[in-house]
């Protein structure tokens, strides 16, 4: 069964290559275990950026080498993607799955266009 997922249309990464956005879902039931996946769409190719499964009320746990971190509050997930460069500019899609208890629900947001601008190198101060 489809579930509505909302996320901002556009986000600009900061000068350190970090971008944050909120992914909000309309839960039809009372999920206790949720899986959040961030997908990147570029040139009609979709790749998985990161994923985390968490228990409601607990922290999101991404893999140690993940470029993502996040926190959850109710039906909102605050996602942060780090280490972005200009070449990483693209559409970042939030996918939410309610894993437990059943029934399974899945929703996909329309995507957040993240713009990343590489900082200008500092001029020599000679």
């Amino acid at each position: 069964k489809a579930m509505h997922v909302a996320q901002p249309a556009v986000v600009l990464a900061n000068s350190r290559g970090t971008a944050s956005f909120v992914c909000e879902y309309a839960s039809p039931g009372k999920a206790t275990e949720v899986r959040v996946t961030v997908l990147r769409q570029a040139d009609s190719q979709v790749t998985e950026v990161c994923a985390a499964t968490y228990m409601m009320g607990n922290e999101l746990t991404f893999l140690d080498d993940s470029i993502c971190t996040g926190t959850s509050s109710g039906n909102q997930v605050n996602l942060t993607i780090q280490g972005l460069r200009a070449m990483d500019t693209g559409l970042y899609i939030c996918k939410v799955e309610l894993m437990y208890p059943p029934p399974y629900y899945m929703g996909i947001g329309n995507g957040t266009q993240i713009y990343v601008i590489d900082p200008e190198p500092c001029p020599d101060s000679d």
Partner: antibody, heavy 114, light 112 residues
């Protein structure tokens, strides 16, 4: 097309054991909660046991608690039900179901009789 | 005795509208969980008829509809047909049992 194929049923004496299997295909097995539901002859549906996608959460009906064990192997897309200390009242058709009984297998008959 | 209460039988004549109720409690339907309905034709495995309170899977005629309010849910069948003669079950997740609960089932008879 979703397919659930149960096997392992048969005739067993009271106190005996059986292991049911359910081979799943046509969907991402590892994403879904799976259950066993049974139906005694001429009776209604009874949820027996269920297991979450990761096997972290397992539940059992009071009538089978301590005797039945549910498990799954996501690499083999297979659900299991180990049934020990079987009683006459466990006689039923056992169905494998996905999610909250969205899809059903054709069932396997378990008969407990001496 | 089932956690969800359904009338054991219901009947109607072809073309009529029949409603089957399913009454639960605060640990299942009243807790906000979705109710699902199943149809079991004689000698066959049950089939999902309504999911998520009021949604029909593809292939299920729009003569079948579901609703939910408080701790109860209901299945309505309009334009009753002879092929609707079957057993109907409701089911929902139950917090206190940490599992799925089924109603006792309702045997629908199409008269005439």
């Amino acid at each position: 097309e979703v397919q659930l194929l149960e096997s392992g049923g048969g005739l067993v004496q009271p106190g005996g054991s059986l292991r049911l299997s359910c081979a799943a295909s046509g969907f991402t097995f590892s994403d879904y909660y799976m259950s066993w539901v049974r139906q005694a002859p001429g009776k209604g549906l009874e949820w027996v046991s269920g297991i979450s996608w990761s096997s972290r959460d397992k539940g059992y009906a009071d009538s089978v608690k301590g005797r039945f064990t549910i498990s799954r192997d996501n690499s083999k897309n297979t659900l299991y039900l180990q049934m020990n200390s079987l009683r006459a009242e466990d006689t039923a058709v056992y169905y494998c179901t996905t999610d909250l009984a969205r899809y059903w297998g054709q069932g396997t008959l378990v008969t407990v009789s001496s | 005795q089932s956690v969800l209460t359904q009338p054991p039988s219901a009947s109607g004549t072809p073309g009529q509208r029949v409603t089957i109720s399913c009454t639960g409690s605060s640990s299942n339907i009243g807790a906000g969980y979705d109710v699902h309905w199943y149809q079991q034709l004689p000698g066959t495995a049950p089939k999902l008829l309504i999911y998520g309170n009021d949604n029909r899977p593809s292939g299920v005629p729009d003569r079948f509809s579901g609703s939910k309010s408080g701790t109860s849910a209901s299945l309505a069948i309009s334009g009753l047909r002879s092929e609707d003669e079957a057993d109907y079950y409701c089911a929902v997740w139950d917090d206190s049992l940490n599992g799925v609960v089924f109603g006792g089932g309702t045997k629908l008879t199409v008269l005439g």
